[in-house]
Interface confidence: medium
């Protein structure tokens, strides 16, 4: 008689990342008997929800249920039916919802209520929808990449995860760029973290970690662009804004009401003699870089050293994984290779921004114009943020690794969030039984 294969003893988890520009659903899977091992959880699916971020539904909350349907139905298909009721679902909202909450706590609660209600209708174990803090976003991103890189494991692995992996147990720092905020998280070298708000203590797999983290709200790439436009329009002589961060020949009309809609532009708000203005691209990297630097206040620092806006930042230490929009933008610009120096990146950005808009549209015919038009700004912003904001240098640039996925799992905060909420990262090193790692043999 033929041997029947035993049913897979696996578990699943779902995390929705409700970001400022869009929502993504991630499905994770792991062997049930190895929950406490490091590196066993992997992503089996990512579903990008069609449409904007949930904060944009504030005036049309009744559409949220329909908005989430496709990806939730996809989860129903991917996860075996027998597992549905045991599969936890978490939704974490990030800086887009933090900004909405700053404007109106009750509107933010309303959106979350409707999200919660919509997600509760599926046959999974819905665990709640909440706005995570910037500190959590940074911490969970750091946990994700180090978990996937095997940095928490005391064992020597039989596999090599990524080309740039060093075999030591030094953790990677995490650099995360979203649409509305950016996070920097790492373990400083024997350095006191001078501001308690930026200090995290973890005990993971029997080892203590003193971690620095900060989330810069309004310094995600989309909100940074709004800030830059609001700052520059202040000094425009008329309703034409000649903008070095857009390609020569590019034109776009912006409503002043849209510009001042976000709390991020409040500091630049003024009464303008027009309701609309036109951006006219002039495509100059150097001038764009200069304009971006004006968003970073470096004149004030109450600590031994700061990033910008008076926020403490210890000296950089070790390797860093740069993910989310850091990766997407640099990947588009073909600048993610380990071999590309910072000087080379700057050179390529200068050339890219100077290319005429008509030429760019022809070269990248398949890319939506809204996104395509902003790569010059976004690339320049990434360089400005990393070099002047976080104090990377031409030498330390080689320690930045632009990461999309590690072992098939997206780098980002969602995996770390789920690992934490499902208690899958033990404080102490689990005792290894003779059988528990038999698959490693």
């Amino acid at each position: 008689t033929q041997n029947k294969a035993l049913p897979e003893n696996v578990k699943y988890g779902i995390v929705l990342d409700a970001g400022s520009s869009h929502t993504s659903l991630y499905i994770y899977k792991w062997p049930a008997e190895k929950e406490n091992d490091t590196g066993v959880v992997h992503q089996v699916e990512e579903c990008r929800v069609k449409g904007p971020g949930i904060s944009k539904f504030v005036q049309k909350v009744n559409e949220i249920g329909i908005y989430l349907t496709d990806c939730m139905e996809r989860a129903r298909e991917v996860i075996p039916r027998s597992q549905h009721q045991e599969t936890p679902v978490y939704l974490g909202a990030t800086a887009g919802m933090r900004l909405l909450r700053m404007e109106s706590e009750e509107l933010a609660d309303r959106v979350l209520d409707v999200v919660e209600r919509s997600l509760s209708n599926y046959p999974f174990d819905f665990q709640g929808a909440r706005i995570i803090t910037g500190q959590e976003e940074g911490a969970y991103g750091w946990i994700t990449i180090n978990y996937l890189l095997g940095k928490f494991s005391q064992k020597t692995r039989w596999f090599s995860i990524v080309p740039y992996e060093t075999n030591n147990q030094e953790t990677f720092g995490a650099l995360d760029l979203g649409g509305a905020s950016t996070q920097v998280t790492f373990v400083p070298q024997n350095q006191t973290i001078e501001s308690p708000d930026n200090a995290l203590q973890f005990r993971l797999y029997g080892k203590d970690y003193n971690v620095y983290t900060h989330s810069f709200l309004c310094y995600g790439k989309d909100q940074a662009l709004w800030q830059k436009l609001a700052k520059d329009i202040q000094v425009a002589s008329n309703e034409i804004l000649r903008d070095p961060c857009f390609h020569p020949g590019y034109k776009k009309v912006v409503n002043v009401s849209d510009l001042y809609k976000t709390p991020c532009t409040k500091r630049f708000e003024m009464t303008l003699p027009f309701q609309q203005f036109e951006i006219q691209g002039i495509g100059n990297y150097q001038q764009c870089h200069q304009s971006i630097l004006e968003l970073f206040n470096t004149s004030y620092c109450p600590y031994s050293q700061c990033a910008f806006n008076g926020i403490f930042l210890p000296p950089l230490q070790g390797d860093f994984g740069a993910f989310s929009a850091f990766y997407f933008v640099m990947k588009f610009l073909n600048l993610t290779s380990e071999k590309v120096s910072q000087e080379k990146v700057t050179e390529m950005m200068k050339k890219f921004c100077a290319q005429p808009w008509e030429e760019i549209k022809t070269s990248y015919a398949g890319v939506k114009e809204k996104y395509l038009s902003e790569y010059c700004f976004s690339g320049t912003y990434i360089l400005s943020l990393l070099l002047q904001g976080y104090h990377f240098t031409a030498d330390s640039w080689e320690h930045i690794h632009f990461i999309g996925k590690i072992q098939g799992s997206d780098a980002g905060w969602t995996l770390g969030y789920m690992l934490n909420l499902t208690n899958m990262i033990p404080a102490e090193q689990p005792l290894s039984t003779p059988l528990s790692h038999s698959t490693y043999v």
Epitope: N62, D113, N121
Partner: antibody, heavy 122, light 107 residues
Framework: QVQLVQSGAEVKKPGASVKVSCKAS????????MYWVRQAPGQGLEWMGR????????KYNEKFKNRVTLTVDTSISTAYMELSRLRSDDTAVYYC???????????????WGQGTTVTVSS | DIQMTQSPSSLSASVGDRVTITCKAS??????IGWYQQKPGKAPKLLIH???TLQPGVPSRFSGSGSGRDYTFTISSLQPEDIATYYC?????????FGQGTKLEIK
């Protein structure tokens, strides 16, 4: 027509538990949420919690969180409310009420059960 | 939680009178309010939802209005069968809350 029919009156001793049922008919059970609302003698209405029959997901009023358990049996279109560790101030009429599920403007209670009187007395 | 302050707690009126009950929410509830009628020994009955939408079969003498935090329920011409307790319900937030009720009596 759409109906919610609840189980009969109960008399319980303090410390005991009570389980009230609510059988739905005339509509698709999983297309509406079921809420439980109670009304103490001469008092107003107070919601206790709700359950999504399609998934079994629940949300409880903090006041009852550790004592109330809501469940459903979709095969017989019935919702249940169990209240444990009963006290004399739990003497009340307990109602089930359905609420629209999908659009936020349909969340009101449009159909109610007839109510179940629970008396807690030693 | 959103608090609903209903007033008056009781009122006495004559047949044919215009009767008004108000509910004030502790925050903007975006018109997500319903009005219920409850007669002794009976379950509440929905009369109006979304501030002013009359349920099918409910007489047109019942109406509702309001926005933001302030809402009004009106019986344009009181009938003997309208003697009951009336409650408002906010369903703007998932944690629904009722007003304390208004007991309506005939003079």
């Amino acid at each position: 027509q759409v109906q919610l029919v609840q189980s009969g009156a109960e008399v319980k001793k303090p410390g005991a538990s009570v389980k009230v049922s609510c059988k739905a008919s005339g509509y698709t059970f999983t297309n509406y949420w079921m809420y439980w609302v109670r009304q103490a003698p001469g008092q107003g209405l107070e919601w206790m919690g709700r359950i999504a029959p399609s998934s079994g997901a629940t949300k409880y009023n903090e006041k009852f969180k550790n004592r109330v358990t809501l469940t459903v049996d979709t095969s017989i279109s019935t919702a249940y409310m169990e209240l444990s560790r009963l006290r004399s101030d739990d003497t009340a009429v307990y109602y089930c009420a359905r609420s629209g599920i999908y659009y936020d403007y349909d969340w009101f209670f449009d159909v109610w059960g007839q109510g179940t009187t629970v008396t807690v007395s030693s | 939680d959103i608090q609903m302050t209903q007033s008056p707690s009781s009122l006495s009126a004559s047949v044919g009178d215009r009767v008004t009950i108000t509910c004030k929410a502790s925050q903007d509830i975006n018109k997500y309010i319903g009005w219920y009628q409850q007669k002794p020994g009976k379950a509440p009955k929905l009369l109006i939802h979304y501030t002013s939408t009359l349920q099918p079969g409910v007489p047109s003498r019942f109406s509702g209005s309001g926005s933001g935090r302030d809402y009004t329920f009106t019986i344009s011409s009181l009938q003997p069968e309208d003697i009951a307790t009336y409650y408002c319900l906010q369903y703007h937030a998932l944690l629904f809350t009722f007003g304390q009720g208004t007991k309506l009596e005939i003079k």
